[in-house]
Interface confidence: medium
């Protein structure tokens, strides 16, 4: 009674830095009983490892076994439906898995007033699980950079988008008081890498920001 | 002296699109901040969208919703705003303006930091 079961319909990896979740929808019909395995094969290492015998949800994160991802040639993912006695064909990931497909997102972003100037501080990606040599500038070490989107609440404009190539950047608000809230997106101008937007922050601008000069 | 000329007005259904030209003339086009304001009959000049001289900040009024893109081509001194899923209410003259100054700046969402106008092009949008 091998192969009764069907196989899960399709199997993909959602990673951000040091963040690999491997996903899969499930199989028509499944009952109570039904689980699903997953094995990994590193690309150089022709051999597929079980790395979980029996998950009961539709995810299963990767990070601990893939930490060498940056460093590597990439990866392949593979996950069969098990119920009992009986399991499913495998269903693989359709592309190798592989720095390219990290999405990029910042960690935070820091804002402060100076003379009318708002001043942006992109704070990277520190994942606990990442090793201590595998920051994401000396990952990405060259070619970073970021979209800026601001929004002024309440104001007539709502985006204004900068490409900034560097961790700071300062907007000139020119006497526009109220709020401002900025959002970043990461990229790297040498990678296909897709970014995330981060969280919006917010800072308020009043008149007591401004110093007059003569 | 900079001179500028808008094309590409017309008539146009609801959620039909256009594209918007302008053409500079005279100084140099390409150390200039410029955008595009719009005037609806019977109201003031209203801010729709702006680029900066190397095209890497774009500004946006915040009616817009994503449906305009601004662009411009440097080599030909021509400053665009490609139009998508108009309204009637986007219904007025199309005004392109370019200012002085490079720095990123809210002052390019104000009508008074722009030194050069063109004439304008009328947009309608109607059934």
């Known amino acids: 009674h091998g192969t009764e079961l069907p196989s899960p319909p399709s199997v993909w990896f959602e990673a951000e830095f040091f963040h690999h979740i491997l996903h899969w929808t499930p199989i028509p019909n499944q009952s109570e009983s039904t689980c699903y395995e997953v094995a990994l094969l590193r690309y150089g290492i022709e051999s597929w490892n079980s790395i979980s015998n029996c998950s009961q949800t539709l995810s299963y994160d990767l990070t601990a076994v893939t930490l060498d991802l940056y460093h590597s040639n990439g990866y392949r993912a593979r996950v069969r439906a098990v119920d009992g006695s009986r399991h499913s064909n495998w269903t693989v990931t359709n592309t190798r898995f592989s720095v390219d497909e990290v999405t990029l997102t910042v960690g935070s972003v820091n804002l402060e007033i100076h003379n009318g100037f708002i001043l942006g501080k992109i704070q990277l990606p520190r994942p606990k699980m990442a090793p201590a040599n595998d920051t994401y500038e000396s990952i990405f070490s060259h070619f970073r950079e970021y979209e800026i989107a601001i929004r002024k609440v309440p104001g007539n404009f709502t985006f204004t988008h900068k490409k900034v190539k560097h961790e700071n950047f300062s907007l000139l608000t020119s006497g526009e008081v109220g709020e401002f809230c900025v959002q970043v997106k990461p990229s790297v101008a040498s990678r296909s890498n897709k970014g995330m937007w981060s969280k919006e922050e917010c800072i308020s601008l009043t008149r007591q920001y401004f110093t007059v000069t003569n | 002296e900079l001179q500028l000329l808008e094309s590409g007005g017309g008539l146009v259904q609801p959620g039909g699109s256009l594209r918007l030209s302008c053409a500079a003339s005279g100084r140099t086009f390409s150390s200039h901040t410029v955008g595009w304001f719009r005037q609806a009959p019977g109201k003031g000049r209203e801010f729709v969208s702006a680029?900066?001289?190397?095209?890497?900040?774009?500004y946006f009024g915040d009616f817009v919703e994503g449906r305009f893109t601004i662009s411009r081509d440097n080599s030909k001194n021509t400053l665009y705003l490609q139009m998508n899923s108009l309204r009637a209410e986007d219904t007025a003259v199309y005004y392109c303006a370019a200012a002085t100054g490079q720095v990123w700046s809210l002052q390019y969402l104000r009508e008074s930091s722009y030194a050069y106008w063109g004439q304008g092009t009328l947009v309608t949008v109607s059934s």
């Open positions: 680029i900066t001289w190397n095209g890497d900040t774009t």
